[in-house]
Structure formats: C-alpha cells, structure tokens
C-alpha cells in the first residue's frame, strides 16, 4: 500500500517517501525504491537554511555599500549573509535592505536610547528639571543647574529647552 504521509525530514513524491536534503544542500533527483534522494551542496555564494526539496539554492544577500550596508555576518551554505548599516545609519526594515541616517532628538527632547545599526534613535521629552538645547543623536536631557549649591539664586526659570539662569542673591540692607 503506497504511503499517504511520510516521517519527519521526508517528503511524498509519486507515492513514495523520500528523504529531504539537509540544510546547505539542494535536490538533484528524487529517491526511487533503489536509490536515496540525490542532493548537492550549495555553491559558495548560495545557501539553504532548512531541510528541503529545493532544486535551486538561494543567493546570499548582498550588502550594498551604496545603500549604506555592510556585512555583519558572512553567509554559509546553511545561513544567509546578515547585513547591518554603517556608523551613523540604521536599517529601514527588519530585513535590512537599506539604511537611513539616525534621527536626532530636537531641542526639548533627549536621547533615551542611542541608535544601533538596526534600530533608530529613541527620543523622550525632557521632564521638568531637565533640558536639551541642541539637536543631537547622542545627548540625553541634562538636569537644570542647581543655583543653591553655588550659593546663587534662580534669576530665570528653566524650560525643557533652556537651563535656569542663576544670579547673586540680593543683599538685604541693615
């Protein structure tokens, strides 16, 4: 009785269960009653990352420097090349097919998380007591100056974009 289903790492072809090709190899010819599945290794620039019956290996991803990409991890016969972005850039998608410059946090916002090759800068509003007066991809919100510790008084209140202005205390006359 011909099989209708096959074991793991097998496939059904013309009423016969054949072994799948292992990762890193492609299918050349299905098995027969007498012969095992014919598989061939992928060439140097190709890969297959699963047990498969593919007749063609997949091309390794090309990390195009014109798109700001560089190789993070070279591909093997079983894995694809992993691209990342050059410094100052990050991927536009999970598959990292192109790069864009990191976002800068505007005045009033500070860097919560510095960008990586795969993720953009994360900005946060400066809370009360903190400010940022620059547009930057690196700088966090800075705390207002503490006038008191300098024996000074606040002459101008700080905002999320400006520091406080300290001045000397008014001397009271006797």
């Amino acid at each position: 009785e011909p099989p209708t289903a096959c074991r793991e790492k097998q496939y059904l072809i013309n009423s016969q269960c054949c072994s799948l090709c292992q990762p890193g190899q492609k299918l050349v010819s299905d098995c027969t009653e007498f012969t095992e599945t014919e598989c061939l290794p992928c060439s140097e620039s190709e890969f297959l990352d699963t047990w498969n019956r593919e007749t063609r290996c997949h091309q390794h991803k090309y990390c195009d420097p014109n798109l700001g990409l560089q190789v993070q991890q070279k591909g093997t016969s079983e894995t694809d090349t992993i691209c990342t972005c050059e410094e100052g850039l990050h991927c536009t998608s999970e598959s990292c097919e192109s790069c864009v410059p990191h976002r800068s946090c505007l005045p009033g916002f500070g860097v919560k998380q510095i960008a990586t090759g795969v993720s953009d800068t994360i900005c946060e509003p400066c809370p009360v007591g903190f400010f940022s007066n620059v547009s930057s991809a690196f700088e966090k919100c800075r705390p207002w100056t503490s006038c008191e510790t300098k024996d000074l008084v606040v002459q101008q209140a700080g905002t999320n974009k400006t520091d406080v202005v300290c001045g000397p205390q008014d001397r009271q006359r006797a």
Epitope: N14, F34, T35
Partner: antibody, heavy 117, light 109 residues
Framework: QVQLVESGGGVVQPGRSLRLSCAAS????????MHWVRQAPGKGLEWVAV????????YYADSVKGRFTISRDNSKNTLYLQMNSLRAEDTAVYYC??????????WGQGTMVTVSS | EIVLTQSPGTLSLSPGERATLSCQAS???????LAWYQQKPGQAPRLLIY???SRNNGIPDRFSGSGSGTDFTLTISRLEPEDFAVYYC??????????FGGGTKVEIK
Amino acid sequence: QVQLVESGGGVVQPGRSLRLSCAASGFTFEKYGMHWVRQAPGKGLEWVAVISYEGTSKYYADSVKGRFTISRDNSKNTLYLQMNSLRAEDTAVYYCARDTSRGHDIWGQGTMVTVSS
Amino acid sequence: EIVLTQSPGTLSLSPGERATLSCQASQSVSYNYLAWYQQKPGQAPRLLIYGASSRNNGIPDRFSGSGSGTDFTLTISRLEPEDFAVYYCQQYSDYPPFTFGGGTKVEIK
C-alpha cells in the same frame, strides 16, 4: 568524473559460470541503486537485474531468474553479476547502469559475454 | 508487464530535417516515468529525456520529449550529423521488469 567500468566478460561454455564486475568512481556509490542491462549482438536493450543502494532489494528479469545473482560491495564501490547455468541466448554485451528517478543516467562501456561450445 | 512498441523501426532522413519517433505503451505509464536513450554503434546508451519531457543535463535543446499515458514522442527538431543513431524508450514506473522498446534507427537518407 563519474564513471562505471565493467569487467569479467569472455567466452564460456554453456552450463558454466561467469562473474561480471562493475567498478564505480566519481560518485557516492553507496547511495545509488544499480542495474545490469544487456544487448545481444544486433538486438535491442534488455533489462537484467537491479539492486538497491544498501543491497536489500533485488529484482530480476524472468529470463535470468534463478540463474543470475546481483550483489554489491559498497566498501569496494563495486557491483557484481554472478551468472550460472549460462545459455547461448545469454550471449550479449552486459552494461551496468546507475539508477535514478530520471532513469539510468550513467552507463559503463560494457563487457562482452559469449556463450559457445 | 508494460510492453513498449517503437515506430517506425527505421527512419531515413537528411541532416536538417525533423525526426519524430513514437513509443506506445501497452498500459498507462504512471507519473510519466518514461525515458529516451540514444545509442551509437559500439557505444553505451546515453540518457536524453526523462519523465517523458525533461532533458537530461548537457542534452541539446533540439531534442524534446512529449506525451503521457500510453503515447510518447521524441522529436529532434533539426537533425545534426551526430544524431544518426538508434533511439530507445524505456518505462521505469512499473517493474519488474524495467522494459525497453525495440528501438528506432535514424539513418542518413
């Protein structure tokens, strides 16, 4: 390169025995089924026998069943055909051929067997 | 047993002409497991077509196979001098035995 080379042919008297060999090279012999196919002088191709890659499954043509035995030694990359009780009608060129789902994709050059008194 | 009948027995043609060879099976060939082989004098057969219509590696595209069920055809679109030979069909779906047709000789006219 992928190659099959037959040997062991010759002239033999009716009723006698002969053993043919087929040496394989250039491929993973132990993964492939192997066939013997023969061709009488001036005639067409006739399938003789097949053996599975590990040697457990064997089939024969009715014309040779009970007289011929196909076997293999994977450690030596060699296929054999033991031919007993030979008859005049067994006179032919004997080819070994590799089994695939595409048919017989690689053939040897053949070895001539002549059964004559 | 599947009996394969090839016709014609001999085909006399000139180089550049089209050759059409027929192979008829006594019962349906499952999964189109039918192959065509070319044999020249003093040489071993060579696999041309498998699965009724797929060309084997390195076979020129002037060779093509077609058909299914019980009727199969090998076509050589433009005969080259090296194509004059004997052609055999073989079924490998129903065995034992693996059966061959009687052959068609393509000769120079």
